[in-house]
Amino acid sequence: AGVFELQIHSFGPGPGPGAPRSPCSARLPCRLFFRVCLKPGLSEEAAESPCALGAALSARGPVYTEQPGAPAPDLPLPDGLLQVPFRDAWPGTFSFIIETWREELGDQIGGPAWSLLARVAGRRRLAAGGPWARDIQRAGAWELRFSYRARCEPPAVGTACTRLCRPRSAPSRCGPGLRPCAPLEDECEAPLVCRAGCSPEHGFCEQPGECRCLEGWTGPLCTVPVSTSSCLSPRGPSSATTGCLVPGPGPCDGNPCANGGSCSETPRSFECTCPRGFYGLRCEVSGVTCADGPCFNGGLCVGGADPDSAYICHCPPGFQGSNCEKRVDRCSLQPCRNGGLCLDLGHALRCRCRAGFAGPRCEHDLDDCAGRACANGGTCVEGGGAHRCSCALGFGGRDCRERADPCAARPCAHGGRCYAHFSGLVCACAPGYMGARCEFPVHPDGASALPAAPPGLRPGDPQRYL
């Protein structure tokens, strides 16, 4: 047994161009929190079960509001370590997923909205009891700096936390055949004899005579892989002529479920249905009641008032599993169209649409003239976040369906009278004025104040103004 510890040092824009926009704003203040998921990395099937080594959620960080115009700085972080306890041996090789989540604190319907800002993953070799290991991971334009270590919980010691130490019985030395427990030189390694034949690579024991398996291995001596690929080499385990025709053991072969649990294959893993009084990935944990809080992610625990009665977790939307430990990212298939931002609010999916788009899935293009008819010969003009019709003479309104009164705007100047006409309007000018809109005064001497005529035409030439 032991604890994996993760310390986040910073989360902010990575080096190089294209710095990300701050995830928070004055209108939408937010705070960050982190989730770490650990899986044993003993085989290609490290994803054999979700977060099989454990998972942890950090506290929420301080509320952050972006300063207008400022680039996104390193964002304020939650206090403290993320700690993932592990009950069995430390596998030595592990894979991790660290997620940075944003909690928006604006006026959200139905409570705060969570969205995933960044997810980094990796596979590392790490001995328990060693120093802090430092790491930098990038996700898009973001950069995460962190340290991690695995430490054993007493009395366990060693690189896998499988050796047990006991205080010395005599002050000077350990008993026959027993070594001092480094680094606890004042303690001795406990005499521990595992079941005969127990695999030294994949098995261990905490009590004499037992053989407990590391993640990914099963069988009485921990020699059977829980699930392997059906082909050990490109041609597989069968003859070179027939190719790979023998499916390997499935995840339920050898029944990894303890205490009478029944195993069923899931799309990528297995699931144990546990008898009353047991729970856990392999039904290995007993005597759990609702008082122990076995339901994660806000799941509601029902029943299980005493250790002999089963409890049931009723999971909130977006989570599943017997303990509501599996998160379902319903945004994964990008349900928001046209570049809309998907928010999984738990109780519902919400799309935040880009400018110019609307609808529950941002499916409506507000600028789109396609399929929007402008009546009576009008033409559709895109722009301004909404389509608009430029109407033919004599028509008006949003879709050019209304007959326009061409004289309504009083277009005839200087007291001219307006007459509506099928082709537009006609102005009858008051004495002393002329032009299509009666805009030009006629001088008493017969000369007009019209613009200069082109060469070859005299001002007042009747051809010019017919």
């Epitope: 059906s230 390997g248 069923s264 294959e265 799309p267 599996k326 990212d329």
Partner: antibody, heavy 124, light 106 residues
């Protein structure tokens, strides 16, 4: 644009082995979260899931057909191969391959793109 | 094995009708998936994770339900909606489909 296409023999004799290939484009089986599955449909009947394979070589087989099925992938060729031994006339069906997506450990998001299918007849 | 039972097996309806197809699982499943299939064509994903519309699927389709009982609803039938509809679960192996519901023009 994502496409999948099934290929293989249209006529197979009883007891023979059927080998079907699914060639796909627009996604890669080296990408985390991606899988390819096989589904069949006898004439006039319902769909039946047969097997699937994930990017990390995790495989699942229908328990009733497990002893006869093998699924493999060739990531570099963008191909998934399904082998079915000891064919019988009741195996006459249209065989489809489809992309499967899982972004959440053990939760399938969707089986969202399908090939057009290939009709395999088992007859002597 | 989890059995999926669709009802009705077939139904006749008219353009503009509101239609509901149900899928009942023999034991609890977390999510339901719905597909539409037209004669001679491959199935097409309609709904994933119980209630999410697949890309390009009109908003007249919707999905709901939890546990063992799930529903596919078409709010106003269009001529192109006449097809066979299948439900499917991904809870445990085998990942079975329903027997199908054939939607015909009245």
């Amino acid at each position: 644009q994502i496409t999948l296409k099934e290929s293989g023999p249209t006529l197979v004799k009883p007891t023979q082995t059927l080998t079907l290939t699914c060639t796909f484009s627009g996604f890669s089986l080296s990408t985390s979260g991606m899988g390819v599955g096989w589904i069949r449909q006898p004439p006039g009947k319902a769909l039946e899931w047969l097997a699937h394979i994930w990017w990390d070589d995790v495989k699942r087989y229908s328990p009733s057909l497990k002893s006869r099925l093998t699924i493999t992938k060739d990531t570099s060729k963008n191909q998934v191969v399904l082998t079915m031994t000891n064919m019988d006339p009741v195996d006459t069906a249209t065989y489809y391959c489809a992309r499967i997506v899982s972004f959440d450990n053990d939760v399938v998001s969707a089986m969202d793109y399908w090939g057009q299918g290939t009709l395999v007849t088992v007859s002597s | 094995d989890i059995q999926m039972t669709q009802s009705p097996s077939s139904l006749s309806a008219s353009v503009g009708d509101r239609v509901t197809i149900t899928c009942s699982a023999s034991s609890s499943v977390s999510y339901m998936y719905w597909y539409q299939q037209k004669p001679g064509k491959a199935p097409k994903l309609l709904i994933y994770l119980t209630s999410n519309l697949a890309s390009g699927v009109p908003s007249r389709f919707s999905g709901s339900g939890s546990g063992t009982d799930f529903t596919l609803t078409i709010s106003s039938l269009q001529p192109e909606d006449f097809a066979t509809y299948y439900c499917q679960h991904w809870r445990s192996n085998p990942f079975t489909f329903g027997q199908g519901t054939k939607l015909e023009i009245k």
